[in-house]
Interface confidence: low
């Protein structure tokens, strides 16, 4: 009988070990060291320590709860010279023994002849002496070759704790010992762990320990029994260093797209070149500006960054598709557009068929200003009049009379969708200087600045639909609102996250988009709209976007 | 000088009662637990009840629903109250105390060697 008993307590004495040899170290000079542990469930486990052993003596644990009707007792057995463990079962593994108000009075007795001698006593609080089980059913749910996904289970521990417990993990490299090996902490109830940068092809063991929050002397669990696991070999010439490939891809992206800029920006030849591959149909300026072109010899760029008075610009004779250019200086424009607020609106136009368009044509006129931004864009306003020619009687707001070129003028009512100034966000773009320095951030959707905007056409179909109404929190400073498109060169002062105040009442001041929107169409809040530079706006596609203004 | 007195022992007919005492002197209950042992002849001591310093009671599984265990701490005395008596529970019945402690149920050999302060018994028989 004695071999099968002694073959369930081995296990416990193995577990029992660490506790005695880290407290017999404590009994000196005859005094003795009495500490146990509580499982959490039904285990205390106890260690005694006594200097100047007694020899062949019997001892045991005898565990008396203050408010429960049981007692129970468990031999001590030796686990070294001076010191002895056992493990007072008090019930199934997984019952829930104790509380947290109980106090066991706990005893070490030992027997002297026919008597038994009590030899340590102390009032026991379990849960503020915890110490759980090991945890167990460790196991390697993915490995690769630099990392590995090990998961496991606690045993045995009480549902009081919910979810406050922390775990603590160590691995084992070749080569090293455990006392080497550097603690991974989790400071929840996270039972499982993905370990990162790992070598190829390498054996590997891992350990993990759990320990509660609460309790004033409660300790780390026996470590784990050992998980010895292999990292995936390396394939040839490939994964050796996961990140290079990428490192390398996106440095030679890097370099290409720079080369590619630069090539765009310095290369006189890439003009024609550019325009043949995507087949824009651009008309020549040559034909519009005859003087130009005899003066400055077919250079655009030399026209437009010509620093003449606007009067030697006159336009020639105009193909029937395109109004008078007209090209103001710098200031004059940006006052004009801030002022046009003031400007009284005019009657409502009597034509149906009149229009006057306004877009960015970026792709093809560039300034290039001392007091700018590297590149920027040149707003042009094109008017056009399909009609004026056959219905001459039919009065033509925004049209030319004659050969010298018209101010354009602000329309009214429902034409003020079609045909505005940009907002003054917008005026930022040609003239920063003109407006004040930044303001923080908007921080209420659809306030003041953040008009409902609604996107043409070509521009709706790059956005996700995801992006249907939703409230918008405030935006985040250096990312911008359309995350989706690629910003042109002169967005970058609003792509750090500057905005700009609005310079007073935003009526009549709107995009072609800036119409409250309709059914079914896209609407959001506080977007800022770079501008279009994937490709021109026609004016079929201008006139698409409200069947109210079809010609 | 510690003392225990039992008292109240004697021969009852089977389905009886009887009420033993125990009168301390030189210490005070409340920091002591007190308990009953009894020994038959032939047989291991056995913890019958315990009343403890926090008001804890223990009955040995033979004893529950007949016997009853209090104590007058004014008086430093503490009772069994024994109903329902049975043959088998004929024996010696020693009074002890010790402080602030647990009862021992199935670890003692026998009694007066345990731990603490033990009376010298009172005899009770249970005849059928």
């Known amino acids: 009988m004695a071999a099968p008993a002694l073959s369930w307590r081995l296990p416990l004495l193995i577990l029992l070990l660490p506790l005695a040899t880290s407290w017999a170290s404590a009994a000196v000079n005859g005094t003795s060291q009495f500490t146990c542990f509580y499982n959490s469930r039904a285990n205390i486990s106890c260690v005694w320590s006594q200097d100047g052993a007694l020899q062949d003596t019997s001892c045991q644990v005898h565990a008396w709860p203050d408010r429960r009707r049981w007692n129970q007792t468990c031999e001590l057995l030796p686990v070294s010279q001076a010191s002895w463990a056992c493990n007072l079962i008090l019930g199934a593994p997984d019952s829930q023994k104790l509380t947290t108000v109980d106090i066991v009075t706990l005893r070490v007795l030992c027997r002297e002849g026919v008597r038994w001698r009590v030899m340590a006593i102390q009032d026991f609080k379990p849960f503020e002496n915890l110490r759980l089980m090991a945890p167990i059913s460790l196991q390697v749910v993915h490995v690769e070759t630099h990392r590995c996904n090990i998961s496991w289970e606690i045993s045995q521990a009480s549902h009081y704790f919910e979810r406050h417990l922390e775990f603590e993990a160590r691995t084992l490299s070749p080569g090293h010992t455990w006392e080497e090996a550097p603690l991974l902490t989790l400071k929840q109830k996270q039972e499982w762990i993905c370990l990162e940068t790992l070598t190829p092809d390498t054996q590997y063991e891992f350990q993990v320990r759990v320990k509660p929050l609460q309790g004033e002397f409660t300790t780390w669990s026996p470590w784990s029994q050992p998980l010895a696991f292999r990292t995936k070999p390396a394939a040839l010439g490939k994964d050796t260093i996961p990140w290079l490939g990428h490192l390398l891809v996106g440095l030679s992206g890097a370099f290409g797209f720079i080369i590619l800029v630069y090539l765009l920006i310095n290369c006189r030849n890439t003009g024609p070149w550019l325009k043949k591959v995507l087949k824009c149909n651009t008309p020549d300026p040559s034909k519009f500006f005859s003087q130009l072109s005899s003066e400055h010899g077919g250079d655009v760029q030399k026209w437009l960054s010509s620093p003449f008075p606007s009067s030697s610009f006159s336009p020639g004779g105009l193909a029937p598709e395109i109004s008078p250019l007209e090209v103001l200086e710098r200031d004059k424009v940006t006052q004009l557009l801030l002022q046009q607020d003031k400007v009284p609106e005019p009657a409502s136009l009597s034509s149906n068929h009149s229009l006057t368009s306004c877009f960015t044509n970026q792709g093809y006129f560039f300034f290039h200003l001392p007091d700018a931004l590297e590149i920027e864009a040149c707003q042009v306003y094109f008017t056009y009049d399909p009609y004026s020619e056959e219905d001459p009687d039919e009065g033509v707001a925004g049209a030319p009379t004659g050969s010298s070129p018209q101010p354009l003028q602000p329309l009214s009512g429902e034409d003020d969708a079609y045909c505005t100034f940009p907002s003054r966000d917008d005026l930022l773009l040609f003239s920063p200087s003109l407006l004040g320095g930044p303001s923080p951030p908007s921080t209420a959707p659809g306030g003041s600045g953040a008009g409902e905007e609604r996107m043409p056409p070509s521009l709706q179909e790059r956005v996700p639909r995801d992006w249907d109404p939703q409230p918008l929190g405030p935006p985040t400073p250096g990312v911008p609102d359309l995350v989706d498109f690629q910003p042109p060169p002169e967005l970058v002062l609003r792509e750090a996250g500057e905005e700009v105040p609005d310079a007073g009442p935003r009526e009549g001041v709107s995009f072609p988009w800036s119409r409250p929107p309709g059914q079914g169409e896209f609407r959001a809040l506080n977007a800022r709209l770079p501008l279009n530079t994937d490709a021109y706006l026609s004016l079929q596609e201008l006139q698409g976007q409200d069947p109210t203004h079809l010609v | 000088q510690v003392q225990l007195q039992e008292s109240g022992g004697g021969s009852v007919q089977a389905g009886g009662s009887l009420r033993l005492s125990c009168t301390a002197s030189?210490?005070?209950?409340?920091?002591?637990?007190m308990g009953w042992y009894r020994q038959a002849p032939g047989n291991e001591c056995e913890l019958v009840s315990s009343i403890g310093s926090l008001g804890r009671r223990y009955y040995a599984d033979s004893v529950k629903d007949r016997f009853a265990i209090s104590q007058d701490n004014a008086k430093n005395t503490v009772y069994l109250q024994m109903n329902s008596l049975k043959p088998e529970d004929t024996a010696v019945y020693y009074c002890a105390a010790t402080k602030g402690g647990s009862w021992l149920d199935s670890i003692l050999a026998s009694c007066q060697g345990a731990f603490g302060y033990w009376g010298q018994g009172t005899q009770v028989t249970v005849s059928s």
């Open positions: 030189g210490f005070t209950f409340d920091d002591e637990d």
